[in-house]
């Protein structure tokens, strides 16, 4: 399947529009600080070069790898050293080390200004004036802030973004039409980015086998009627797609994702009965739809798992001679029977099964040793079930905001060394599990909740990796991908933590809080709550609740005052003094 010119091959496969968009995403994800205009210039140069290769694949440099071509282009940026510091050293390396070097410098939390949404009329004017630039800017701004965003999926988001403006800029009430659509895209985009970040972390930190195991479990739940060989083929192809995207090979990734969607739709009869609608859609919608498709119904009369995985005389032989196949079959068979389990739970069960076989197979009576292996699964299943039950009860009792606050306190006490913005962001996201999952019936709660928590805790792990401050976080993040959530759940209050010095400035608020959105105001209050816990880690729930209630009343009072700033100054001093007294600071 070798092509004389890889760049020509991808240009022809993807078409000019997608080619340009994907190169822009790739460049923005690597050089996150570069101005938009610089990236557009680089993309245009690459595109013109690609066209010369399409015309003549034997033309000079057309035989070079995409990494070589793109890397050479990125290394022409004049301000590389000033803007990126040591990342400029990547340019002294040869491929593939140069690309690895660029990948290592991707920043999950780049120092970029918050995206402020202009007025609707301003956006509509910009959209009409230059639609192409407007949409490119969207790709650029998302890609540089989310350097692992799944590129072919970002093309889908851009298509929806364009559709929203096309429709709403002609509407009578532009804002009423557009703003909810943009909010939905923003929230879905953040979720999509976080989900993809976990896939990349899984591949990069735990290896291909970890990702494949995840994919076997998930696809077996989704396609329980498909044969193991079919699931294995899909897993192999899906792994290739995500390996490419996570490795910065976005053209190959998008091309292979399109091929995979085509294959799935051509073979839907042997995969799933739920694919029909997806397969009638255009490419980007089709791929997205397949990725989100509901689980197919389980085949009737599936036999007991015990026959093949406990009772068979060949269990140990099959395990020893091909662990990947045998354990893959175990995972497939277990997952297709259990759409009610989270993927991480299924992987824990498979690991327990593997560990038991490894311990038992060399024993004098292997069968006697592993006969009760399924009994070992019971506590593993009950632990997330109980945790979800307790937390959904708490969520229903408190509501989302107060549930987030309970988690903020819980996690700040567990890992108080973590930065306040990270604790706020992660705990707020952890708290969203309530409204996202607790509404579901029992059979859907665990896959929703625990797999979502895996995504959120991965955010904590990648942010912490950038500036590690807590050995406990490092341990939970690196020891086992599937046991991250149980590891964090098991953490108690960090008794070694020396409370933070009290700083009145941290608790000084101004009138600008009154003009903030409800969400921003919540974040301010939650930031104060984390700081309180860092000052007084032994504070009780009741103490913290009293202080937070006083704080909410103080904000409400001063925002109603005529002279807001004076109110914040005077009442703020009183509040700080009262809080110090209440907490014994």
């Amino acid at each position: 399947d070798a092509h004389k010119s890889e760049v020509a091959h991808r240009f022809k496969d993807l078409g000019e529009e997608n080619f340009k968009a994907l190169v822009l995403i790739a460049f923005a994800q690597y050089l996150q600080q570069c101005p938009f205009e610089d990236h557009v210039k680089l993309v245009n140069e690459v595109t013109e070069f690609a066209k010369t290769c399409v015309a003549d694949e034997s033309a000079e440099n057309c035989d070079k790898s995409l990494h070589t071509l793109f890397g050479d282009k990125l290394c022409t940026v004049a301000t590389l050293r000033e803007t990126y510091g040591e990342m400029a050293d990547c340019c002294a390396k040869q491929e593939p080390e140069r690309n690895e070097c660029f990948l290592q410098h991707k920043d999950d939390n780049p120092n970029l200004p918050r995206l402020v949404r202009p007025e609707v009329d301003v956006m509509c004017t910009a959209f009409h004036d230059n639609e192409e630039t407007f949409l490119k800017k969207y790709l650029y701004e998302i890609a540089r802030r989310h350097p692992y965003f799944y590129a072919p999926e970002l093309l889908f988001f851009a298509k929806r973004y364009k559709a929203a403006f096309t429709e709403c800029c002609q509407a009578a009430d532009k804002a009423a039409c557009l703003l909810p659509k943009l909010d939905e895209l923003r929230d879905e985009g953040k979720a999509s980015s976080a989900k993809q970040r976990l896939k990349c972390a899984s591949l990069q930190k735990f290896g291909e086998r970890a990702f494949k195991a995840w994919a076997v479990a998930r696809l077996s739940q989704r396609f329980p009627k498909a044969e193991f060989a079919e699931v294995s083929k899909l897993v192999t192809d899906l792994t290739k797609v995500h390996t490419e995207c996570c490795h910065g090979d976005l053209l190959e990734c998008a091309d292979d994702r399109a091929d995979l969607a085509k294959y799935i739709c051509e073979n839907q009869d042997s995969i799933s009965s739920k694919l029909k609608e997806c397969c009638e859609k255009p490419l980007l919608e089709k791929s997205h739809c397949i990725a989100e498709v509901e689980n197919d119904e389980m085949p009737a009369d599936l036999p007991s798992l015990a026959a093949d995985f406990v009772e068979s005389k060949d269990v140990c032989k099959n395990y020893a001679e091909a662990k990947d196949v045998f354990l893959g079959m175990f995972l497939y068979e277990y997952a297709r029977r259990h759409p009610d389990y989270s993927v991480v739970l299924l992987l824990r069960l498979a690991k327990t099964y593997e560990t038991t076989l490894e311990k038992c197979c060399a024993a004098a009576d292997p069968h006697e040793c592993y006969a009760k292996v399924f009994d070992e699964f019971k506590p593993l299943v009950e632990e997330p079930q109980n945790l979800i039950k307790q937390n959904c009860e708490l969520f229903e009792q408190l509501g989302e905001y107060k549930f987030q606050n309970a988690l903020l306190v819980r996690y700040t006490k567990k890992v108080p060394q973590v930065s306040t913005p990270t604790l706020v962001e992660v705990s707020r996201n952890l708290g969203k599990v309530g409204s996202k999952c607790c509404k579901h019936p029992e059979a859907k709660r665990m896959p929703c909740a625990e797999d979502y928590l895996s995504v959120v805790l991965n955010q904590l792990c990648v942010l912490h990796e950038k500036t590690p401050v807590s050995d406990r976080v490092t341990k939970c993040c690196t020891e086992s991908l599937v046991n991250r959530r149980p590891c964090f759940s098991a953490l108690e209050v960090d008794e070694t933590y020396v409370p933070k010095e009290f700083n009145a400035e941290t608790f000084t608020f101004h009138a600008d809080i009154c003009t903030l959105s409800e969400k921003e105001r919540q974040i301010k209050k939650q930031t104060a709550l984390v700081e309180l816990v860092k000052h007084k880690p032994k504070a009780t729930k009741e103490q913290l609740k009293a202080v937070m209630d006083d704080f909410a009343a103080f904000v409400e009072k001063c925002c109603k005052a005529d002279d807001k700033e004076t109110c914040f100054a005077e009442e703020g001093k009183k509040l700080v003094a009262a809080s110090q007294a209440a907490l014994g600071l």
Epitope: C316, K317, Y319, E321, K359, A362
Partner: antibody, heavy 121, light 110 residues
Framework: EVQLLESGGGLVQPGGSLRLSCAVS????????INWVRQAPGKGLEWIGI???????FYATWAKGRFTISRDNSKNTVYLQMNSLRAEDTAVYYC???????????????WGQGTLVTVSS | DIQMTQSPSSVSASVGDRVTITCQSS???????LSWYQQKPGKAPKLLIY???KLTSGVPSRFSGSGSGTDFTLTISSLQPEDFATYYC???????????FGGGTKVEIK
């Protein structure tokens, strides 16, 4: 003290056969997996195969067919039967126990002192 | 085909030196099924490290192992006279039949 002791090595002609023994003392062999590993003069280690406590055997791909591992728990001994020997089979042959609690992992905690097999005409 | 490549094949070092030996596997070993052995002339190998980083009982703490997947390292933090020997890595794979050792690294006195 646990000991593994290989015997049965010596000079053998190409095409010939040899049976090596690994006598185990200090533990009940019936509970453990035993491996055979060889080392050609001045070369590295090469895994030959394993026999589990249950008697199930597995071999390196290259060893299948010519080499057979067996055990006699009553004698606390494991055997390596080698057929159609070639000059390149000349090596010190070791028996080694797999660390208890593992079945397929390359963790061998107790080794014999080795027995030299020379294949030459 | 399974490849277990050890490097360097030999290293000259002095007492007190830090010595690092690497082992590269293709394909990746089964979930950290990697061991390190020490062998002195005329003697049987001795298991130092298993599961890539766990020290066998009685092995001095100056020995440490790290790595996962395809790349592994054995480090001797401060070489002692009794550490001059040949070191082998051993890898386990999806199939037990693929159990393999690296080519060895001889640690010699400088």
């Amino acid at each position: 003290e646990v000991q593994l002791l290989e015997s049965g090595g010596g000079l053998v002609q190409p095409g010939g056969s040899l049976r090596l023994s690994c006598a185990v003392s200090g533990i009940d062999l019936s509970n453990y997996a035993i491996n055979w590993v060889r080392q050609a003069p001045g070369k590295g280690l090469e895994w030959i195969g394993i026999i589990w406590a249950s008697g199930t055997t597995f071999y390196a791909t290259w060893a299948k067919g010519r080499f057979t591992i067996s055990r006699d728990n009553s004698k606390n001994t494991v055997y390596l039967q080698m057929n159609s020997l070639r000059a390149e089979d000349t090596a010190v042959y070791y028996c080694a126990r797999t660390v208890p609690g593992y079945s397929t992992a390359p963790y061998f905690d107790l080794w014999g002192q080795g027995t030299l097999v020379t294949v030459s005409s | 085909d399974i490849q277990m490549t050890q490097s360097p094949s030999s290293v000259s070092a002095s007492v007190g030196d830090r010595v690092t030996i690497t082992c590269q596997s293709s394909p990746s070993v089964w979930i950290n099924f990697l061991s390190w052995y020490q062998q002195k002339p005329g003697k049987a190998p001795k298991l130092l490290i298993y599961e890539a980083s766990k020290l066998t009982s009685g092995v001095p703490s100056r020995f440490s192992g790290s790595g996962s997947g395809t790349d592994f390292t054995l480090t001797i933090s401060s070489l002692q006279p009794e550490d001059f020997a040949t070191y082998y890595c051993g890898g386990g794979y999806s199939s037990i039949s693929d159990t393999t050792f690296g080519g060895g690294t001889k640690v010699e006195i400088k």
